[in-house]
Amino acid sequence: FTITVSKDLYVVEYGSNVTMECRFPVEEQLDLVSLIVYWEMEDKKIIQFVQGKEDLKVQHRSYSQRAQLLKDQLFLGKAALQITNVTLEDAGVYCCLIGYGGADYKRITLKVHAPYRKINQRISVDPVTSEHELMCQAEGYPTAEVIWTNSAHQVLNGKTIISVSNMETKLFNVTSTLRINTTANEIFYCTFLQRSSPEGNSTAELVIPEPFLVPANERTH
């Protein structure tokens, strides 16, 4: 009795859904009473399916309402674990153990990343030095480095601060600032680079606005 996996590594985005599956041999009709399916992650029990019933009492609380065994897939010889709203804590090595006449188990790794997609930006002017301060802030995982460039393909020196945005989500809060003497309409780019997944790089475009001129009759002295 041997079980197989089509993938032993799943890489998914934070907040998305994932279905990991282990395949086992089924000849014609599936005998549910003879089937045992366990899904575990490290020391956490996720699924305990015995004699056609799922025992939710043993399920670790972190998977409550989020993890389920897709019962209809069992008849196709697939023990499919679906996890919804994936968190960073869900990353790790999963083990599917199946008993059906014989017994076998396989390991599957789940990696979770959170792209720095939503970049907040701000442009301000230092009234003393007339320097512009450009700021880009975003949340993601794992940590990202931020590079600043201009439209002439030059890399500029910004200052980046990384903190944990929320102890619950474990996402990183990355804030980068660039102080520069510049003029209206110049374009700058802040790019959040994730070495682990280059396709997850995100960029914001910052255009220096025209200076805000206060009409002479509205100026305060």
Partner: antibody, heavy 121, light 111 residues
Framework: EVKLVESGGGLVKPGGSLKLSCAAS????????MSWVRQTPEKRLEWVAS????????YYPDSVKGRFTISRDNAKNNLYLQMSSLRSEDTALYYC??????????????WGAGTTVTVSS | DIVLTQSPASLAVSLGQRATISCRAS??????????MNWYQQKPGQPPKLLIY???NLESGIPARFSGSGSRTDFTLTINPVEADDVATYYC?????????FGGGTKLEIK
């Protein structure tokens, strides 16, 4: 149609000056960094100068620094290269080239047909 | 300055066959998770035309017969299959650091 048309080339004596122009059309000129690239008679390509979209930042290789000045007029959609203290090794076909738009798109994606500069006594 | 050495200086390939052009950089052109190597095609009497950027990305409108590969210091432009219209000189160019430099070119001819 995206188009770059260079003009202003010609024959000039060593030590002389010349100003090249490049007329851009078919794209939002003021959003792009621009460059000049030259091709020597031996067909070697050399980057000459770059300028940011707003004209604030300019960059040059050491071979032309202090002698060449790149500038632009976004209202007229024109790019310029002022060349002075010209040397025989500046003889080349000068191309106006658009820089790739966005972060990390570091390439020349549109080229003009070029204008020839000959430095000879 | 980063020196780019292209090889061969010229090559003749039969129609329908594969052409491989190499470009070696005197130092790495990799940074920020990218390889900043570009490839251009120049036909006689015409300006250079961008084919491949960041080592392996095909420029819009360029046929899939053209492909690029490599990282750090060693890069390759492959044309497969070669067509009559591909007769040109091909240049590699690094944009990882100033001054931006070009290779000496490889002239492709049909056998």
């Amino acid at each position: 149609e995206v188009k770059l048309v260079e003009s202003g080339g010609g024959l000039v004596k060593p030590g002389g000056s010349l100003k090249l122009s490049c007329a851009a059309s078919g794209f939002t000129f003021s959003s792009y960094g621009m460059s000049w690239v030259r091709q020597t008679p031996e067909k070697r390509l050399e980057w000459v100068a770059s300028i940011s979209n707003g004209g604030t930042y300019t960059y040059y290789p050491d071979s032309v620094k202090g002698r060449f000045t790149i500038s632009r007029d976004n209202a007229k959609n024109n790019l310029y290269l002022q060349m002075s203290s010209l040397r025989s090794e500046d003889t080349a076909l000068y191309y106006c080239a658009r820089l790739g738009y966005g972060s990390l798109n570091w390439y020349f994606d549109v080229w003009g047909a070029g204008t020839t500069v000959t430095v000879s006594s | 300055d980063i020196v780019l050495t292209q090889s061969p200086a010229s090559l003749a390939v039969s129609l329908g066959q594969r052409a491989t052009i190499s470009c070696r950089a005197s130092e790495s052109v990799d940074s920020y998770g990218n390889s900043f190597m570009n490839w251009y095609q120049q036909k006689p009497g015409q300006p250079p035309k961008l084919l491949i950027y960041r080592a392996s990305n095909l420029e819009s409108g360029i046929p899939a017969r053209f492909s690029g590969s490599g990282s750090r210091t060693d890069f390759t432009l492959t044309i497969n299959p070669v067509e009559a219209d591909d007769v040109a000189t091909y240049y590699c160019q690094q944009s990882n650091e100033d001054p931006r430099t070009f290779g000496g070119g490889t002239k492709l001819e049909i056998k």
